[in-house]
């Protein structure tokens, strides 16, 4: 008799999930020698323990606490780049500007980036068929709770000037419902963070508007100011040129506004 299995609205666990997490962990420790002594099998065991045998709509931040004990990786607190709805460019930027870090440049972020996972209540199985969708099923699912937890800790660790890359092509440049808007903004520590500097990335070549005057950016400024953190905003009119100038800052064309 086939066992009844809960059908969720979202895609199932990424295929070869355990192997992928383990392989990413090993690769990360090879790329980052300061993590050379991390035991990736123990990392996987803690990751697995957060969601295996648990109802995938009843996951809490507490479930991830054993894994978060590894999250003491020291990223320079004044070199943090947050992003919202513009992940690829943010990652391209930190690949060039090696002394700046997005969440996905840390071990835990690197392990989980673009992956989906969930288990089933009372069985040790990983569910490869379907996982809860944040909107249609539940918000307390393994993936959402993981990102909420690591994002909160990442924001809490930030200091001095924190940068955030925002997508100027979206109707809501700053979205209060994004991870940045709902978690990271509210967990920046005013006693440590002096300024949040937003980089608004323009999409169109001929788009010369000052998107820093956008109502949603003004909303962000208001939220940040109320938290006793200064706010500044820059338009990045030409993201391609922006990246090029990060690579080659001496280039004569890099003195003009980008």
């Amino acid at each position: 008799v086939p066992r009844w299995r809960q059908q969720w609205s979202g895609p199932g666990t990424t295929k070869r999930f355990p192997e992928t997490v383990l392989a990413r962990c090993v690769k990360y420790t090879e790329i980052h020698p300061e993590m050379r002594h991390v035991d990736c099998q123990s990392v996987w065991d803690a990751f697995k323990g957060a969601f295996i045998s648990k109802h995938p709509c009843n996951i809490t931040e507490e479930d991830y606490q054993p894994l978060m004990k590894l999250g003491t990786q020291t990223v320079p607190c004044n070199k943090i780049l947050l992003w919202s709805r513009i992940k690829d460019l943010a990652h391209q930027f930190t690949q060039v500007q090696r002394d700046m870090f997005t969440l996905e440049d840390t071990l835990l972020g690197y392990l989980a980036d673009d992956l989906t996972w969930c288990g089933e209540f009372n069985t040790s199985k990983i569910n490869y068929q379907s996982c809860p969708d944040w909107r249609k099923d539940c918000s307390n699912n393994p993936v959402s709770v993981f990102w909420k937890t690591v994002s909160r800790r990442f924001a809490e660790a930030a200091c001095d000037v924190v940068h955030v890359m925002l997508n100027g092509s979206r109707s809501k440049i700053f979205d209060k419902n994004s991870t940045f808007g709902s978690v990271e903004v509210h967990n920046l520590q005013p006693e440590k963070v002096q300024t949040l500097e937003a980089w608004v990335i323009h999409g169109g070549r001929e788009d010369s508007r000052d998107l820093c005057q956008d109502p949603t950016i003004k909303e962000l400024e208001s939220i940040i100011s109320k938290r006793n953190i200064q706010f500044s905003c820059k338009n990045i009119y030409r993201p391609d040129k922006f990246l090029q100038c990060v690579k080659n800052p001496e280039d004569s064309s890099c003195t003009s506004e980008i």
Epitope: E30, P33, E34, R36, H37, V38, S42, L70, T72, Q73
Partner: antibody, heavy 118, light 110 residues
Framework: QVQLVESGGGLVKPGGSLRLSCAAS????????MSWIRQAPGKGLEWVAS????????YYADSVRGRFTISRDNAKNSLYLQMNSLRAEDTAVYYC???????????WGQGTLVTVSS | QAGLTQPPSASGTSGQRVTISCSGS????????VYWYQHLPGTAPKLLIY???QRPSGVPDRFSGSKSGNSASLAISGLRSEDEADYYC???????????FGSGTKVTVL
């Protein structure tokens, strides 16, 4: 074969300074993390400091932070430990060790004795 | 600073099996590799086990390492007189940003 030879130990008064050296051979020195580990008389091993390869990052035990400085000269295949504000409890045999990629100390020198006494 | 906890001594007769425990926390053993070193007085310490259970070439297979959670252990089977030495476990510790050693275990062959 891999050889690590420490030198620079000796008798020094409390508050004094000493500089230990470690001459390395038999491996590509610039590729590896290097460390100092000590053993006080009748006590166990205690990690003191490490220095990374590449653009050096340094790591120190709480007991020596602010007083000791680890450094390296890749051109000379040498590791150093500058010890200032020495205390009686710093009396120990100091070993230089080569760290492998998994973090283990694969090769050790024979050690040099530092005695801090008035 | 708190290191890793080892029993001060262990003993066995020739040919016996001896196990040495090493306990720590999630900030050291929990998420990091465990290493074991053998130290004979007057000589340089020698790496015995790395990455929890790996033996460097030249180390006899009588020595084996294991790890579970926040604890690790070293087993010496077929104990021999030349195994009389001090044994130390070690691991990186995140909270200290450095290595921690165990207090050491003196193994005596009776």
């Amino acid at each position: 074969q891999v050889q690590l030879v420490e030198s620079g130990g000796g008798l020094v008064k409390p508050g004094g300074s000493l500089r230990l050296s470690c001459a390395a051979s038999g491996f590509t020195f610039s590729d590896d993390y290097m460390s100092w580990i000590r053993q006080a008389p009748g006590k166990g091993l205690e990690w003191v400091a490490s220095v990374s390869n590449g653009r050096p990052t340094t790591y120190y035990a709480d007991s020596v932070r602010g007083r000791f400085t680890i450094s390296r000269d890749n051109a000379k295949n040498s590791l150093y430990l500058q010890m200032n504000s020495l205390r009686a409890e710093d009396t120990a045999v100091y070993y230089c060790a080569r760290e492998a990629w998994g973090g283990e100390f694969t090769n050790w020198g024979q050690g040099t004795l530092v005695t801090v006494s008035s | 600073q708190a290191g890793l906890t080892q029993p001060p001594s262990a003993s066995g007769t020739s040919g016996q099996r001896v196990t040495i425990s090493c306990s720590g926390s999630s900030s050291n053993i929990g998420f990091h590799f465990v290493y074991w070193y053998q130290h004979l007085p007057g000589t340089a310490p020698k790496l015995l086990i790395y990455k929890n259970n790996q033996r460097p070439s030249g180390v006899p297979d009588r020595f084996s390492g294991s790890k579970s959670g926040n604890s690790a252990s070293l087993a010496i089977s077929g104990l021999r007189s030349e195994d009389e030495a001090d044994y130390y476990c070690a691991a990186w510790d995140d909270s200290l940003s450095g290595y921690v050693f165990g207090s050491g275990t003196k193994v005596t062959v009776l």
